[in-house]
């Protein structure tokens, strides 16, 4: 999957663009909005009717090295009585993000962008019957 | 990718930090093996905390299109289709990394940017706040 070139006609390549080798791109890893914070409601992972746990995956050759993945705790959803209602399903909500992968080849290093799928949390859905044609 | 020689200390002295500027292969590797969009494509409608998806487009960013979720109701949808306001629909947010063209309009020069997206909604029991 290649990153598309800027398509708009008024997007002429400015003179100030840095020279980049063919088939590559220049990437500044100094993050814009580095200190932005998630302002999600408190403890939603335990208060949800489709609660989830978090697992941290760690890879020193990935940036960011820490990626947090959610796992739904139940097959069903928690009802008002605190019981698991299996007429409903807890399902994962996923989001793609980019990571930067560092690869070692002998005494040299290369960098590759990767799309990874992060499970962000869970939601409670009504299953539907598959009707055979 | 583009191979960058390590310093003379190789192979012992590995830099634990990523360099400030790197050359990266234009091809983006896709690691998503266990997902199938047809399965999750209608969660936004079937959830007890349904949401609408809003298109956020920016040609100076990769990916240029990001979908933002907005919960449809304050409460959660019951089996009978009515909204239960004893429960709350709340957004699930996630920080993701995107690429921002820098300098602007440059086809092959980017900077990493962290953005906050609402991915979907979940139904939660509200917290009762007791005033001391």
């Amino acid at each position: 999957r290649k990153i598309p070139k800027v398509g708009h006609t008024f997007f002429q390549k400015p003179e100030s663009c840095p020279p980049v080798p063919e088939g590559s791109m220049k990437l500044d890893t100094g993050i814009i909005n580095e200190n932005q914070r998630v302002s999600m409601s408190r403890n939603i992972e335990s208060r949800s009717t489709s609660p989830w746990n978090y697992t941290v995956t760690w890879d020193p050759n990935r940036y960011p090295s820490e990626v947090v993945q959610a796992q739904c705790k139940h097959l069903g959803c928690i009802n008002a009585q605190g019981k698991e209602d299996i007429s409903m399903n807890s399902v994962p909500i996923q989001q793609e993000t980019l990571v930067l992968r560092r690869k070692h080849q002998g005494c040299s290093v290369s960098f590759q962008l990767e799309k990874v799928l992060v499970t962000v949390g869970c939601t409670c859905v009504t299953p539907v019957v598959h009707h055979v044609q | 990718g583009i191979a960058i020689p390590r310093n003379s200390g190789c192979p012992n002295s590995e830099d634990k930090n990523f360099p400030r500027t790197v050359m990266v292969n234009l091809n983006i590797h896709n690691r998503n093996t266990s997902t199938n969009p047809k399965r999750s494509s209608d969660y936004y409608n079937r959830s007890t905390s349904p949401w609408n998806l809003h298109r956020n487009e920016d040609p100076e960013r990769y990916p240029s299109v990001i979908w933002e979720a907005k919960c449809r109701h304050l409460g959660c949808v019951k089996a009978d289709g009515n909204v239960d306001y004893h429960m709350n629909s709340v957004p699930i947010q996630q920080e993701i990394l995107v690429l921002r063209r820098e300098p602007r309009h440059c086809p092959n020069s980017f900077r990493l940017e962290k953005i906050l997206v609402s991915v979907g909604c979940t139904c939660v029991t509200p917290i009762v706040h007791h005033v001391a």
């Epitope: 299996i86 399903n89 807890s90 299953p127 539907v128 019957v129 598959h130 | 199938n36 399965r39 209608d42």
Partner: antibody
Framework: EVQLVESGGGLVQPGRSLRLSCAAS????????MHWVRQAPGKGLEWVSG????????GYADSVKGRFTISRDNAKNSLYLQMNSLRAEDTALYYC????????????????WGQGTTVTVSS | EIVLTQSPATLSLSPGERATLSCRAS??????LAWYQQKPGQAPRLLIY???NRATGIPARFSGSGSGTDFTLTISSLEPEDFAVYYC?????????FGQGTKLEIK
């Protein structure tokens, strides 16, 4: 023809292990959650375990939790049940069954069943 | 767990007669109840799901009704192939559970 064929049953001593397999054909296997249901001789049906389309959601009956492991290989259209620390009360005919829910989720109602494989736990 | 009690344990009827099988839940299961038929030496067969919906290929003589705790499977006019054991099953609360079965035999 939609079909499920179980195998791997047999006579085993208490405390030993057995692995059951179920080969699916005639439908898109990874579009559905799958289940194991057992029936002790002369008795009724007991749900044992279930697994969703991509193995992301798995459930077990309390009677087998910690001893049995359900898994699936979508590339091979196969469902498995690894049974460890077997007990006399695990003696039963084990059925593999397909869930009726779309999108690989759980409905917990089953519309396609195999003919079953017999597991006998005895010393 | 939810206990499903089926009655009667055995029902003796003749072909052409109407059969009424009952399933009672220890607590409400809403309409999340299914019915299965099992003949000797065969696997169970799904007849009804969600209390009243006939599964694919099931003849119209089979019908289900009820909600909450009391459910009924009705076979309007018995055919010789209908004599079997019938099980109800709930999918309301964890874990899914089956009733002990009703044996429908030829009188």
């Amino acid at each position: 023809e939609v079909q499920l064929v179980e195998s791997g049953g047999g006579l085993v001593q208490p405390g030993r292990s057995l692995r059951l397999s179920c080969a699916a054909s005639g439908f898109t296997f990874d579009d559905f959650a799958m289940h194991w249901v057992r029936q002790a001789p002369g008795k009724g049906l007991e749900w044992v375990s279930g697994i969703n389309w991509n193995s992301g959601s798995i459930g077990y009956a309390d009677s087998v939790k910690g001893r049995f492991t359900i898994s699936r290989d979508n590339a091979k259209n196969s469902l498995y049940l690894q049974m460890n620390s077997l007990r006399a009360e695990d003696t039963a005919l084990y059925y593999c069954a397909k869930d009726i829910a779309a999108a690989g989720e759980f409905y917990f109602d089953m519309d396609v069943w195999g003919q079953g494989t017999t597991v006998t736990v005895s010393s | 767990e939810i206990v499903l009690t089926q009655s009667p344990a055995t029902l003796s009827l003749s072909p052409g007669e109407r059969a009424t099988l009952s399933c009672r839940a220890s607590q409400s299961v809403s309409s999340y109840l299914a019915w299965y038929q099992q003949k000797p030496g065969q696997a169970p067969r799904l007849l009804i799901y969600d209390a009243s919906n006939r599964a694919t290929g099931i003849p119209a003589r089979f019908s289900g009704s009820g909600s909450g705790t009391d459910f009924t499977l009705t076979i309007s006019s018995l055919e010789p192939e209908d004599f079997a054991v019938y099980y109800c099953q709930q999918r309301s609360n964890w874990p899914p559970t089956f009733g002990q079965g009703t044996k429908l035999e030829i009188k």
